[in-house]
C-alpha cells in the first residue's frame, strides 16, 4: 500500500545558477493525497531559517504531483543564498534539503573592466 | 544618457488593435527590464506588463488576455500590442525602464507618454 | 491583487508647514515607492524602498513605514512640492499604484 505521507522533493545540494534582473521561479515539488497541505518557504541564515513574508507564491499542478513555487520578479543580488520549504501535515512539520540560488549581478559584471581592459588601462 | 520614447497611433477605433513602440537610448534591453503604465482619469496608473532582460514576460493578470510584449534588442526597441480596445482603453501611455538595487527594484526613468484615444 | 489607498486625496499646506500623507495596502508589503507628477509630465521617482530619496530630491522629503502602512513626509512645505504623489508596492503581480495624492500650496 501508497504511502501517504506528505513528501517534498528537493535534491539535497540542489543548486541554481541565475542572473539578477530576471524573473525566476523556485520550485518545492510537494507529493500529497487527500488535503493539500500548507507550505511555506525560508531562507537560511547559519543555522535558522527565516520565514519568507510577503513573498509572491503560488502553487502549480502536474500529474500526481504539485509545486509549490517561490516568484522572484526579479531577482535581486540579495536573494543569492540557500531556501528551504516546509509543509505542515497532521501537525507535524516536514523540511525539504535545502536549495541554493547563486546569483550573479549582471550590472556589476558588465560595467566592471576585462582583464585586458585593465592590464591595457595598466600599461598605456 | 537614459532615454525612453514612445510612439503611437493616437487615436484607434473600438475593437481594433493598438501598438506602440518604445524606443530607448542610453542602456541595453539585455541589462534593463523596460515596463508598460498607462494613466487614465478614471484608472489612474495603472501596470500592463514587462519585458524583462533575458527575453521573458510578466503580465498584470487583468488585461493580460489582450496584451503581448516584445522586443528587439539590436534596434534597442520593445513593443506594446493591445487587442480589442475599448473607450476605456483611452490613456496615457508610458514605457518605463526597470532597475535593481541590492535589495529592492523599482522603475526609475519614464518616458514622455503616448496618448492613445479610443474613439469611432 | 493588493490595494493601495492613498489619504487624503487632496491636501492644502502652506509654505514652511509640515506636510504628511498616508498609503495603506490592503495586503503587507515589503516596501513602498513614491512617484511625484506634475501637470503635463511623467511621474518621477522620489522615494524608493520605503525611505531612499531619488536623486535631486530635497532633504525636506522622508518616508517610513512597514508592513500596510507607509508615509511621506515633507518638513517644511515649499511651493514646487505642489503636485501629485503615488505610492507603488513592487511586491506582488499585479503591481499596483495608489490614487495619488494632490498636494497644494495655500
Known amino acids: 500500500k501508497e504511502s501517504c505521507d506528505v513528501q517534498l522533493y528537493i535534491k539535497r545540494r540542489s543548486e541554481h545558477s541565475i542572473l539578477a534582473g530576471d524573473p525566476f521561479e523556485l520550485e518545492c515539488p510537494v507529493k500529497y493525497c487527500a488535503n493539500r497541505p500548507h507550505v511555506t518557504w525560508c531562507k537560511l541564515n547559519g543555522t535558522t531559517c527565516v520565514k519568507l513574508e510577503d513573498r509572491q507564491t503560488s502553487w502549480k499542478e502536474e500529474k500526481n504531483i504539485s509545486f509549490f513555487i517561490l516568484h522572484f520578479e526579479p531577482v535581486l543580488p540579495n536573494d543569492n543564498g540557500s531556501y528551504r520549504c516546509s509543509a505542515n501535515f497532521q501537525s507535524n512539520l516536514i523540511e525539504s534539503h535545502s536549495t541554493t540560488l547563486y546569483v550573479t549581478d549582471v550590472k556589476s559584471a558588465s560595467e566592471r573592466p576585462s582583464k585586458d581592459e585593465m592590464a591595457s588601462r595598466f600599461w598605456a | 544618457q537614459v532615454q525612453l520614447k514612445e510612439s503611437g497611433p493616437g487615436l484607434v477605433a473600438p475593437s481594433q488593435s493598438l501598438s506602440i513602440t518604445c524606443t530607448v537610448s542610453?542602456?541595453?534591453?539585455?541589462?534593463?527590464?523596460v515596463h508598460w503604465v498607462r494613466q487614465s482619469p478614471g484608472k489612474g496608473l495603472e501596470w500592463l506588463g514587462v519585458?524583462?532582460?533575458?527575453?521573458?514576460?510578466s503580465y498584470n493578470p487583468a488585461p493580460m488576455s489582450r496584451l503581448s510584449i516584445s522586443k528587439d534588442n539590436s534596434k534597442s526597441q520593445v513593443f506594446l500590442k493591445m487587442n480589442s480596445l475599448q473607450t476605456d482603453d483611452t490613456a496615457m501611455y508610458y514605457c518605463?525602464?526597470?532597475?535593481?538595487?541590492?535589495?529592492?527594484?523599482?522603475?526609475?526613468?519614464w518616458g514622455q507618454g503616448t496618448s492613445v484615444t479610443v474613439s469611432s | 491583487q493588493i490595494v493601495l489607498s492613498q489619504s487624503p486625496a487632496i491636501l492644502s499646506a502652506s509654505p514652511g508647514e509640515k506636510v504628511t500623507m498616508t498609503c495603506r495596502a490592503s495586503?503587507?508589503?515589503?516596501?513602498m515607492h513614491w512617484y511625484q507628477q506634475k501637470p503635463g509630465s511623467s511621474p518621477k521617482p522620489w522615494i524608493y524602498?520605503?525611505?531612499n530619496l531619488a536623486s535631486g530630491v530635497p532633504a525636506r522629503f522622508s518616508g517610513s513605514g512597514s508592513g500596510t502602512s507607509y508615509s511621506l513626509t515633507i518638513s517644511r512645505m515649499e511651493a514646487e512640492d505642489a503636485a501629485t504623489y503615488y505610492c507603488?508596492?513592487?511586491?506582488?503581480?499585479?503591481?499596483?499604484f495608489g490614487g495619488g495624492t494632490k498636494l497644494e500650496i495655500k
Open positions: 518605463v525602464r526597470g532597475d535593481y538595487e541590492y535589495d529592492y527594484y523599482a522603475m526609475d526613468y
Open positions: 542610453g542602456f541595453s534591453l539585455t541589462t534593463y527590464g
Open positions: 519585458m524583462w532582460p533575458g527575453g521573458r514576460t
Open positions: 495586503s503587507s508589503v515589503s516596501y
Open positions: 524602498a520605503t525611505s
Open positions: 507603488h508596492q513592487w511586491s506582488s503581480n499585479p503591481y499596483t
